[in-house]
């Protein structure tokens, strides 16, 4: 008897759709898998026989819900399936979004970029696929641990009127308020403003 | 919110034409990959032929070189021209998008496309 692969889960983040399981203890030798997914009352193949343990779904739809499903395999024998359902839109993890930032004397000027969606070619971000798209920002004096968080309305913001040559930290993350969903904290950056008068041109 | 509107169906004779429309609303064809599917009584639903967002089309073995598929991004609507129809091209014929998709490959699969028509049947008689 084939054991089933475990630890079967999806990892999506940006619609970039991984499969991935664990290969079972299985004494007779190296097992394969074959992972699939239902398109419409039939289960279709998308990773056959493949020595691993992981499988791309990202050409699924990233609306509504999927049945994923894999084996294990050694020669004619195979273990049952593993069965997960999956829908992107809601389960898929919104990555960092990246973040510009420049100093302008005691102001942080920042602009914000979207996660692409990971398995397209062309530009389409994250920003496309939900409506509701707003940005978290959070922000701290290096070295303290107060934060303070502000909710954008555009693509960029100016934290004005701050300290004089005090480096602050800053860092933003995608928010859907309408599924009350927070995407990644993206890595921070610290920025050291300069003095309080506007630098001549 | 999405939704597809198919027109264009009907009967015609074996190596007759039809032309199938599907206008979108909700929508912007230009930001997606759009398909052709159908469905004959007691089988599966196939893939037709399929475009992405560049314009780039692919089609099925069995329709290649008697249908064309096309879209007018202004006119936000595909189209499906189809020629020298045969008896075995009756089916019910559904439009379906996903929107922001590339042409990174050909979507052929129901599971790919996340929005579809009510349908418009094709009956060809011989």
């Known amino acids: 008897m084939v054991p089933p692969p475990e630890n079967v889960r999806m990892n999506s983040v940006n619609f970039k759709n991984i499969l991935q399981w664990e290969s079972p203890a299985f004494a007779k030798g190296n097992l394969t898998f074959t992972a699939q997914y239902l398109s419409y009352r039939i289960f279709q193949d998308k990773c056959m026989n493949t020595t691993l343990t992981e499988c791309d779904f990202s050409s699924l739809s990233k609306y509504g819900d999927h049945t994923l499903r894999v084996r294990a395999e050694f020669a004619d024998e195979h273990s049952d399936w593993v069965n997960i359902t999956f829908c992107p839109v809601d389960d898929t993890i919104i990555g960092p979004p990246g973040m510009q930032v420049e100093v302008l004397a005691d102001s942080l000027h920042m602009r914000f970029l979207a996660p692409k969606i990971e398995n397209e070619y062309e530009t389409w971000t994250m920003k496309n696929v939900y409506n509701s798209w707003t940005y978290n920002v959070q922000y701290w004096k290096n070295g303290t641990d107060e934060k303070f968080q502000i909710t954008p309305q555009y693509d960029f913001e100016v934290l004005r009127n701050l300290e004089p040559w005090t480096t602050y930290c800053v860092q933003v993350r995608g928010f859907l308020p309408d599924r009350n969903k927070a995407g990644e904290w993206s890595e921070p950056v610290c920025e050291q403003t300069t003095h309080d008068e506007t630098v001549p041109s | 919110q999405v939704q597809l509107q198919e027109s264009g169906g009907g009967s015609v004779q074996a190596g007759g034409s039809l032309r199938l429309s599907c206008a979108a609303s909700?929508?912007?064809?230009?930001?997606?990959?759009m398909g052709w599917f159908r469905q004959a009584p007691g089988k599966e639903r196939e893939a037709v032929a399929a475009?992405?967002?560049?314009?780039?089309?692919s089609y099925a073995d069995s329709v290649k070189g008697r249908f064309t598929i096309s879209k007018d991004n202004a006119k936000n609507t595909l189209y499906l021209q189809m020629n020298s129809l045969k008896p075995e091209d009756t089916a019910m014929y559904y439009c379906?998008?996903?929107?922001?998709?590339?042409?990174?490959?050909?979507?052929?699969?129901?599971?790919?496309?996340?929005?579809w028509g009510q349908g418009t049947q094709v009956t060809v008689s011989s």
């Open positions: 379906a998008a996903e929107p922001y998709c590339s042409g990174g490959y050909p979507r052929w699969s129901v599971a790919e496309f996340g929005y």
């Open positions: 909700g929508y912007t064809y230009s930001s997606g990959c």
């Open positions: 475009i992405n967002s560049d314009g780039s089309t």
